[in-house]
């Protein structure tokens, strides 16, 4: 691959942890001890994009598996997805746009904004196990800060 | 701001093993998302990557010089070190140790180097 | 491959635009970047992923990469331009790969 990854794990800013709910969708609910396995970790790639100081496109890969958080509309909405790719072909450098994702830190938080759809974000309800999604609203009573826990390679 | 000093004897016998050490400055080796480095620099010639380590992974190294070489990390020490055994006098050169942010895809901060002789 | 190729030097006259050249196989298709180095000193990086300027680096310093092709541009060269220019990139195969370097001579 021309790009470099590394592999980590999110967690929202209320502690929730990324899971696997089925083979196409992600939902976020606290986990202790030994469940802590089930979380799913990512494969960030750094790929072509707009970028400033704060902000670097990022593709966000299941690790190991040929499977991208991608945004799409549906029904005129911007929705996120999992979708499959063909591994032989990703990640690359010139990912698709529905494929990237505008990583923003501020105050030690991430923010994943789509590049597709400005301004929406990946988000988490405040409820539990409840699925992973866009959201076009920031600060309210969705969330849409996450942190980032290194992963070994 | 983040500094980087390599350090090191100047002067290896041949087919010993040359040691270099990488103190970092104003940031930690054990922060995610950098790749530290070391490269180097035979007199008047280009730049050869020697490899690096990634502190949540295992470290690369130039296909050309694998079995010779050996990057570690010491976080208590806040350093990074190159190990490389049965030195000749081809790897007579500047040895230089530079921080690369994962994302830039380039090393943006280097050390002033340290030139290392192999002979007798 | 792995190589990137540029020529070994460029002249340009004081004011003018300077371009060097750094070819490798489907080189678009990676992150290329560019470092200058004057005589008895540290590389420092001018550009970053193709295009992008470090801070401190003046806004005459450019770079685009397409093709086989990653390009560093110095518009309205100046004589403390003068220095070798190395271009690199990266891939999960080779890891990183420098060019053998450009001579800038400013006239």
């Known amino acids: 691959a021309p790009v470099r990854s590394l592999n980590c794990t999110l967690r929202d800013s209320q502690q929730k942890s990324l899971v696997m709910s089925g083979p196409y969708e992600l939902k976020a609910l606290h986990l202790q001890g030994q469940d802590m396995e089930q979380q799913v970790v990512f494969s960030m790639s750094f790929v072509q994009g707009e970028e400033s100081n704060d902000k670097i496109p990022v593709a966000l890969g299941l690790k190991e598996k040929n499977l991208y958080l991608s945004c799409v509309l549906k029904d005129d909405k911007p929705t996120l997805q999992l979708e499959s790719v063909d591994p032989k072909n990703y990640p690359k450098k010139k990912m698709e746009k529905r494929f990237v994702f505008n990583k923003i830190e501020i105050n030690n938080k991430l923010e994943f904004e789509s590049a597709q759809f400005p301004n929406w974000y990946i988000s988490t309800s405040q409820a539990e196990n409840m699925p992973v999604f866009l959201g076009g609203t920031k600060g309210g009573q969705d969330i849409t800060d996450f942190t980032m826990q290194f992963v070994s390679s | 701001q983040v500094q980087l000093q390599e350090s090191g004897p100047g002067l290896v016998k041949p087919s010993e093993t040359l040691s270099l050490t990488c103190t970092v400055s104003?940031?930690?080796?054990?922060?995610?998302?950098?790749?530290w480095s070391w490269i180097r620099q035979p007199p008047g010639k280009g730049l050869e990557w020697i490899g690096y380590?990634?502190?949540?992974?295992?470290?690369n190294y130039n296909p050309s010089l694998k079995r010779r070489i050996a990057i570690s990390v010491d976080t208590s020490k806040n350093q990074f070190s190159l190990r490389l055994s049965s030195v000749t006098a081809a790897d007579t050169a500047v040895y230089y140790c530079?921080?690369?942010?994962?994302?830039?895809?380039?090393?943006?901060?280097w050390g002033q180097g340290t030139t290392v002789t192999v002979s007798s | 491959s792995s190589e990137l190729t540029q020529p070994p030097s460029v002249s340009v006259f004081p004011g003018q635009t300077a371009n060097i050249t750094c070819s490798g196989d489907?080189?678009?298709?990676?992150?290329a970047c560019w470092y200058q180095q004057k005589p008895g000193q540290s590389p420092v990086l001018v550009i970053y992923?193709?295009?992008k300027r470090p801070s401190g680096i003046p806004e005459r310093f450019s770079g685009s990469n397409s093709g086989n092709t990653a390009t560093l541009t110095i518009s309205g060269t100046q004589a403390m331009d003068e220095a070798d220019y190395y271009c690199?990139?990266?891939?999960?195969?080779?890891?990183?790969?420098f060019g053998g370097g450009t001579k800038l001579t400013v006239l």
């Open positions: 104003g940031g930690s080796v054990s922060s995610g998302g950098y790749y």
């Open positions: 690199q990139a990266w891939d999960s195969s080779t890891y990183v790969v």
């Open positions: 380590f990634y502190y949540s992974g295992s470290p």
């Open positions: 489907k080189l678009g298709d990676k992150f």
């Open positions: 530079a921080r690369d942010p994962m994302h830039y895809y380039g090393m943006d901060v």
């Open positions: 992923r193709d295009n």
